[in-house]
Interface confidence: medium
């Protein structure tokens, strides 16, 4: 059986939309499937790699690599999207390419960044972990770390940094899929909202879905002990 909830929820474009949340109900009138997984049910994607989920994560990563920061022209906010999802008339799509990206490093200007921009994250403005010396962030945003400390300044002069961020990674469903969404949408969908991250590649949704002890390697499920828990 399914339980359907419909509600007006604030979406990425800053407008309220009618959204449906479909929850698979437990046939035996008990905890939901997500709760059962958290409690240690034998859910194979938490025990070993699931090809389907792996493909989904890789697909999401490929899309994210090509994303940019969509900044609303009315200064209402910005969100990480694909170019096709960013209005050409109402917004500015900040995407580095050819010669528009900043240099990879201050000491060598020949190498320009082509991956990015990312809303509210920039290697030039992050102090921890700083992109410098031996630890220069790669030219692939899906390999960027979470910036835990931004340089203290109200304005950077960069469009993708001086905007109000409207969406962050949200882990939705037992498949561990990730979307950049508003907090409202994420909570309505019973997802896990990552306030600390800017990109889906920075979070490990399956790890969150499975709960219990975190995976040793966030990308590799290893909860074999589930076989004895349930």
């Amino acid at each position: 059986a399914q339980h359907v909830t419909t509600q007006l929820v604030l979406r990425n474009k800053g407008v309220y939309e009618s959204v449906k949340y479909i929850q698979q109900e437990n046939f035996w009138i008990g905890p939901s499937s997500i709760d059962l997984i958290h409690l240690g049910a034998k859910f194979s994607p938490c025990i070993r790699k699931d090809q389907q989920i792996e493909q989904l994560v890789l697909r999401e990563r490929d899309l994210e690599r090509d994303s940019g920061c969509c900044v609303q022209n009315d200064h209402s906010g910005c969100i990480q999207t694909q170019r096709k999802d960013c209005s050409e008339t109402l917004a500015t799509f900040v995407k580095w390419q050819d010669d528009t990206g900043p240099p990879m490093d201050k000491s060598d200007l020949g190498q320009k960044r082509t991956s990015g921009a990312v809303c509210h994250q920039d290697p030039r403005t992050c102090e921890e972990p700083a992109s410098s010396g031996a630890h220069i962030w790669p030219d692939d945003i899906t390999k960027w770390p979470i910036c835990t400390e931004q340089a203290k300044s109200n304005r950077t002069g960069f469009l993708h940094m001086d905007c109000q961020i409207k969406g962050r990674p949200c882990c939705i469903s037992t498949k561990g899929s990730c979307e950049i969404t508003t907090r409202e949408y994420c909570e309505f969908m019973h997802g896990y909202f990552h306030e600390e991250a800017t990109l889906c590649s920075q979070v490990h949704c399956l790890d969150k879905v499975c709960g219990l002890l975190p995976f040793l390697n966030p990308e590799v499920p290893d909860q074999f002990y589930r076989l004895w828990l349930s």
Partner: antibody, heavy 122, light 107 residues
């Protein structure tokens, strides 16, 4: 309006440490993408880049002089400092500071100070 | 380090004349080159950056161009205040390096 002004001891003796100050206005080193560099010019010779400090405190030095150079900044006072240890006659020169800008494009050394003359003599 | 070979080392020219100075980079600098003017009193002013972009307030008679690893500064019609020393500067890589300079004298 961006201005930079260098100051130094004028004269000092061999083996001493040269301390130079660059005081600037019209910009702040707490602003992303800005930096200040030091350059010198010995009499009748060309220009030689010495060191650079960026808004995020990242520092670069001329490898040929690195062991003797120390660059630092006081963001609140709008000042950048350069120390050159163990000076000798070859360090006699006019020392300039200049602003640099690092962003999408890179506008190197766009504003220069007037220079300060330093003589190393016993 | 990147070597910048500047020529000529000195140049005598008359008012109204067109002159051209050249810098050659020993390695690829991708257009990260500026031209500086140093007046007899020691003051230094940047004229051009990114090989050909004129700084604001610089007269249009100055122009910069690039051909491969050769970078040129041209002054279309010399005026009295143009007689000075000129240096090229590469800023593609640290350490920044300068050309040896061209002394432009009045004939």
């Amino acid at each position: 309006q961006v201005t930079l002004k260098e100051s130094g001891p004028g004269i000092l003796q061999p083996s001493q440490t040269l301390s130079l100050t660059c005081s600037f206005s019209g910009f702040s080193l707490s602003t992303f993408s800005l930096g200040v560099g030091w350059i010198r010019q010995s009499s009748g010779k060309g220009l030689e880049w010495l060191a650079h400090i960026w808004w995020d405190d990242e520092k670069y030095y001329n490898p040929a002089l690195k062991s003797r150079l120390t660059i630092s900044k006081d963001t609140s006072k709008n000042q950048v400092f350069l120390k050159i240890a163990n000076v000798d006659a070859a360090d006699t020169a006019t020392y300039y500071c200049a602003r640099a800008y690092y962003s999408k494009s890179y506008y190197a050394l766009d504003y220069w100070g007037q220079g300060t003359s330093v003589t190393v003599s016993s | 380090d990147i070597q910048m070979t500047q020529s000529p080392s000195s140049l005598s020219a008359s008012l109204g004349e067109r002159v051209s100075l050249t810098c050659r980079a020993s390695q690829e600098i991708s257009g990260y080159l500026s031209w500086l003017q140093q007046k007899p009193d020691g003051t230094i002013k940047r004229l051009i950056y990114a090989a050909s972009t004129l700084d604001s307030g610089v007269p249009k008679r100055f122009s910069g161009s690039r051909s491969g690893s050769d970078y040129s500064l041209a002054i279309s019609s010399l005026e009295s205040e143009d007689f000075a020393d000129y240096y090229c500067l590469q800023y593609a890589n640290f350490p920044f390096t300068f050309g040896s300079g061209t002394k432009l004298e009045i004939k």
